[in-house]
């Protein structure tokens, strides 16, 4: 999957543009908004009816090598008693990610821009029901 | 940046972290994934903290299209399909990694950004506390 | 800790209006939504109004809806309930609610009557 290109109907390439080998793109990883702190309500992960474990995982090859992944604790929802229903599913809710891969072929070095799948939370969900003849 | 082992036949020039700016590859590596989650799973309305998706659009980002996820409801569906106050439907979000053209409008010169995005929602029991 | 302060209850006739304010202050970060609880002598507490801190949206009960709105002001971190049209049924304690997604703090209350 391709990067699309700037479309003319947005805007002409400007002239400053840096040039770049063909096939290939220029990327600074000096991330933008790096240091911004985010609130994120607290542990949510552990009130929810669909309650979720968290996951690093760890990679040297991967820009940025630490990716945080949650599993759904319980096929069921907790209910208002503390108990776990099974006639409702916890289900995992995903988003794509970019990450930078690199990759080692011999001694020299090449980056590779990769979709990652993160697990972000759970949430209760009720299903669909069929009845197999 | 990130330390990485080195083959050790390699000359020694190399830098153990990653470098600042970086060529990578245009074709981007990874399941042609369906962006539109409401074409992926309808989790959205069946949740008992159903979302809406809403649709976040940036041609000098890629990629240029991000659904962003905002509760129904304030409270949770019960079993009746009404709505109980007395739980809280409350957004997920996630920092994810999008490319920003740098500078603008340039086609093949990007730089990493981070974006903090809702992706759906979770029904949460609040603990209560009565104010004196 | 998180302090609530209500303030606007009182008697009034059918049909009067009357308007209800709650402040917040302490560590009311993060919030998630703010909104009013009523409870009328041996019933059940139920949700009136609420609204979420993020995009201003708002949520009524059936019993209330176009005649009682919400509104807040986030700069000093308080929501205002304008009632109108009241009715004999409206007559309740009424308690401000400050929402924190995983915590949720009530105000002591503050009864509004309406009778002829």
């Known amino acids: 999957r391709k990067i699309p290109k700037v479309g003319h109907t947005f805007f002409q390439k400007p002239e400053s543009c840096p040039p770049v080998p063909g096939g290939s793109m220029k990327l600074d990883i000096g991330i933008i908004n790096e240091n911004q702190r985010v609130s994120m309500s607290r542990n949510i992960e552990s009130r929810s009816t669909s309650p979720w474990n968290y996951t690093v995982t760890w990679d040297p090859n991967r820009y940025p090598s630490e990716v945080v992944q949650a599993q759904c604790r319980n096929l069921g929802c907790i209910n208002a008693q503390g108990k776990e229903d099974i006639s409702m599913n916890s289900v995992p809710i995903q988003q794509e990610t970019l990450v930078v891969r690199r990759k080692h072929q011999g001694c020299s070095v090449s980056f590779q821009l990769e979709k990652v799948l993160v697990t972000v939370g759970c949430t209760c969900v009720t299903p669909v029901i069929h009845h197999v003849q | 940046g990130i330390t990485i082992p080195r083959n050790p036949g390699c000359p020694n020039s190399e830098d153990k972290n990653f470098p600042r700016t970086v060529m990578v590859n245009l074709n981007i590596h990874n399941r042609n994934t369906n962006t539109n989650p409401k074409r992926s799973s309808d989790y959205y309305n069946r949740s008992t903290s159903p979302w809406n998706l809403h649709r976040n659009e940036d041609p000098e980002r890629y990629p240029s299209v991000i659904w962003e996820a905002k509760c129904r409801h304030l409270g949770c569906i019960n079993a009746d399909g009404n709505v109980d106050y007395h739980m809280n439907s409350v957004p997920i979000q996630q920092e994810i990694l999008v490319l920003r053209r740098e500078p603008p409008h340039c086609p093949n010169s990007f730089r990493l950004e981070k974006i903090l995005v809702s992706v759906g929602c979770t029904c949460v029991t609040p603990i209560v506390h009565h104010v004196a | 800790e998180v302090q609530l302060v209500e303030s606007g209850g009182g008697s009034v006739q059918p049909g009067d209006s009357l308007r209800l304010s709650c402040a917040a202050s302490g560590r009311a970060n993060s919030i998630n939504w703010f909104g009013w609880f009523r409870q009328a002598p041996g019933k059940e507490r139920e949700f009136v109004a609420g609204?979420?801190?993020?995009?201003?949206?708002?949520e009524y009960a059936n019993s209330v809806k176009g005649r009682f709105t919400i509104s807040r002001d986030n700069s000093k971190n308080t929501v205002d309930l304008q009632m109108d049209s009241l009715r004999p049924e409206d007559t309740a304690v009424y308690y401000c609610?400050?929402?924190?997604?995983?915590?949720?703090?009530w105000g002591q209350g503050t009864l509004v009557t309406v009778s002829s």
């Open positions: 609610v400050l929402d924190l997604s995983t915590v949720r703090y």
């Open positions: 609204i979420r801190w993020s995009d201003a949206y708002t």
